[in-house]
Interface confidence: low
């Protein structure tokens, strides 16, 4: 059933004629102008109180009637001043005015909190004309009020460029508390105090707050909103929420999880991305971060050779990008590799160790005792050397690379020769006479080319010279290679 709260509306004594409240049952409005489709309200407040007209904002008509009587001031009738209702209820309120018929083109507009209400609001204006006056009732209905409908509503009427304003009608929508600030999930240090905040508003006020931890109330006595809960410290994860109470009932906030920061879990899936003679590129999948962002990671490397001294090399790196190139490793060696990462609480355990190997390396030593001499009869340069002492990890010797540079007036050219690993001598053709030949030799393994020997120079005379002797690598300590002719 629709209940209407009505007050009797009486016309001004000066304006005789029918008016709402004293209308005949067969008296219907001559004209009804709906602004938008109307809805049947659950509650209706009628327009007027009996008696005097409203005296706030009035317009004094300057026109006189045929009998030259001055017309009274125009004003909206008093109406209900304050409506309190619950959220989602319907409400209808109105304002009314009686206007002499000499005025044409009267319009009534609704305003809320200083802004005109346009468009799809449920406003209807009804006109009840009589011989001398027209009673105008402007109704405004809201089918299901929200908090946003709270505010001050007024009617405005323009007549002959004059503006008449009604008394305000205050709408107060009451409902369950509404949260403006809810507790946030946090990651906290064990046994360290932290704060949670909860704030809710009405109307109706006041709003009282109860805190709930793991389904149990924390405070026996409610606190007025806003409330800050100081938790002295936790030793394990907990879920907090807050209850907001007012006269309309109770609203419960979302439950937030408070996690206890812990050391991270160890990384998983450490894998080898790439391996060279002296470096290994690894990647890993980080473990659970312990509710605290990773700060950095430590790569631990130890030689897997049972004869090694067991020392561990440690390389520190940033937590991202879960990738690290371990450098300065020995060639052709086996290593065990583990990864540990840290957050603000501490270091994780080491990941499962993985085995990785470096590839063969390039030789680390140049061939020794390089000797160069001219075999004039065959127009060749003979080169001899001693095989360098190779470490096991340098890999298997596959040969030698010989660089010979020929320099004479205005000419310089370099040639490279590759020779097999078996010999320790080579013969190269004379390229230019009356020139200096500079020879350097490097050993080669599958791991790459080693360092070149110190240069050895020999002068190749013009045809017909007889005196010659070999050139060789100088003894240690000499500053320059010796040229022997």
């Amino acid at each position: 059933a629709i209940t209407e709260a009505r007050e009797e509306a009486k016309p001004y004594p000066l304006f005789p004629g029918p008016f709402p409240g004293s209308l005949q049952t067969d008296h219907t409005p001559l004209l009804s102008l709906p602004h938008a489709s109307g809805y049947q309200p659950a509650l209706m407040f009628s327009p007027t109180q009996p008696g005097r007209p409203h005296t706030g904002n009035v317009a004094i008509p300057q026109v006189t009637s045929v009998e030259s009587k001055p017309l009274p001031p125009l004003a909206f009738k008093h109406t209900v001043g304050h409506i309190i209702l619950s959220e989602h209820k319907g409400v209808k309120f109105n304002c009314s005015i009686s206007v002499p018929n000499i005025y044409q083109d009267t319009t009534i507009s609704w305003w809320k909190d200083g802004k005109e209400l346009l468009g799809a609001h449920h406003a209807i204006t009804q006109f009840y004309p009589d011989d001398e006056v027209t009673a105008i009732i402007a109704s405004f209905s809201i089918t299901s009020v929200q908090r946003s409908d709270n505010g001050s509503y007024i009617c405005k009427m323009k007549i002959n460029n004059e503006e008449i304003v009604s008394d305000p009608i205050y709408i107060e929508v009451q409902g369950l508390p509404h949260f403006t600030k809810q507790p946030e999930s946090m990651n906290v240090t064990r046994n360290t105090a932290f704060n949670l905040t909860c704030q809710a508003v009405g109307p109706p006020e006041p709003v009282n707050i109860f805190w709930v931890q793991n389904s149990s109330r924390v405070n026996e006595q409610p606190e007025k909103s806003p409330s800050v809960l100081t938790v002295p410290g936790l030793t394990e994860m907990a879920v907090f929420s807050c209850e907001a109470h007012n006269d309309k009932g109770l609203t419960v906030s979302k439950g937030v999880q408070i996690n206890i920061k812990a050391i991270p879990s160890p990384p998983t899936e450490v894998s080898i991305r790439n391996s060279t003679a002296h470096s290994i590129l690894i990647s890993w999948v980080p473990g659970f971060d312990g509710y605290s962002p990773f700060r950095n990671c430590s790569i631990q490397v130890k030689e897997a050779d049972p004869l090694s001294n067991g020392s561990v090399m440690i390389f520190n790196t940033s937590a991202l990008p879960h990738l690290y190139q371990i450098k300065q490793l020995q060639a052709l060696a086996n290593y065990s590799i583990g990864v540990s990462c840290m957050n603000e609480i501490g270091w994780s355990a080491v990941s499962p160790w993985i085995l990785a190997s470096t590839t063969e390396g390039a030789p680390s030593v140049a061939p020794l005792n390089v000797t160069v001499f001219l075999n004039e009869s065959s127009d060749n340069v003979d080169i001899r050397w001693m095989k360098p002492p190779t470490k096991q990890q340098d890999g298997e010797l596959v040969g030698y690379r010989i660089s010979h540079v020929w320099q004479s007036a205005g000419i310089s050219k370099e040639l490279l020769e590759e020779v097999g690993q078996n010999g320790s001598r080579a013969r190269i053709s004379v390229q230019v006479h009356n020139a200096t030949c500079t020879v350097r030799i490097a050993a080669v393994t599958r791991g790459g080319v080693g360092p070149f020997s110190d240069p050895v120079k020999i002068f190749i005379p013009a045809h017909g010279w007889v005196d010659y002797a070999p050139s060789s690598t100088p003894a240690p300590g000499n500053a320059d290679p010796v040229l022997i002719i």
């Epitope: 946030e184 946090m186 605290s292 962002p293 937590a319 991202l320 990008p321 879960h322 690290y324």
Partner: antibody
């Protein structure tokens, strides 16, 4: 140091790729971000790229930009430039990040100017 | 969307005075403290001043300080010098899948 290159005048709709080269540190151990600044305006973060995870973009930049990296460079492709993309583009080293969340941007390039005009 | 609001677009101070710049974050920055401050002078790239809300970047004078946690942060410059006239930006890291970093609008 960080150095951007590739900025120039382009017409709307013409794809453009900016390149960032670094020295003094290795791209294998740092995430990198791109930030832009329109003339007279503030800074806008475009996204972050790391070795281990896919690039993370600002919502407004997704689809409009592509960030990629090689072992020596970081690239930013403006897929279909509009006049609104006129800006100085900075390549920036990310000192530390987790799950694509930058902690701080600690080393900035001088920027390269991109002008989009018909 | 992640939003960092620097309410003052410009502030002024006398040489030797103190100036404060505020920055409000919505939502809270990652770990409550992943908030950094940058200084940018005309024609130059930005320079990192403060990170983790209050930690001084290397080479930055101790007259610069930062404070705050969660959603409210402040940069303070004491004994301010002429050559510190610049635009100052706050920036924060956030834990969502995208928009994991954002800058404030800047304060000149």
């Amino acid at each position: 140091s960080v150095e951007e290159s590739g900025g120039r005048l382009v017409t709307p709709g013409t794809p453009l790729t900016l390149t960032c080269t670094v020295s003094g540190f290795s791209l294998s151990t740092y995430s990198m971000s791109w930030v832009r600044q329109a003339p007279g305006k503030g800074l806008e973060w475009l996204g972050i790229v790391s070795v281990a995870i896919d690039p993370v973009y600002a919502t407004w930049a997704r689809g409009r930009f592509t960030i990629s990296r090689t072992s020596t460079t970081v690239n930013l492709k403006i897929t279909s430039p509009t006049t609104e993309d006129t800006a100085t583009y900075f390549c920036v080293r990310v000192a530390f990040s987790t799950n694509g969340i930058p902690h701080r941007l600690d080393l900035w390039g001088q920027g390269t100017l991109v002008t989009v005009s018909s | 969307a992640q939003v960092l609001t620097q309410t003052a677009s410009s502030v002024s101070a006398a040489v030797g005075g103190t100036v404060t710049i505020s920055c409000q974050s919505s939502p809270s920055v990652y770990n409550h403290n992943w908030l950094s401050w940058y200084q940018q002078k005309p024609g130059q790239p930005p320079k990192l001043l403060i990170y983790e809300a209050s930690k001084l970047a290397s080479g930055v004078p101790s007259r610069f300080s930062g404070s705050g946690s969660g959603t409210q942060f402040t940069l303070t410059i004491s004994d301010v010098q002429c050559d510190e006239a610049a635009t100052y930006y706050c920036a924060g890291g956030f834990s969502s899948g995208s928009d994991s970093f954002a800058f404030g609008g800047g304060t000149e």
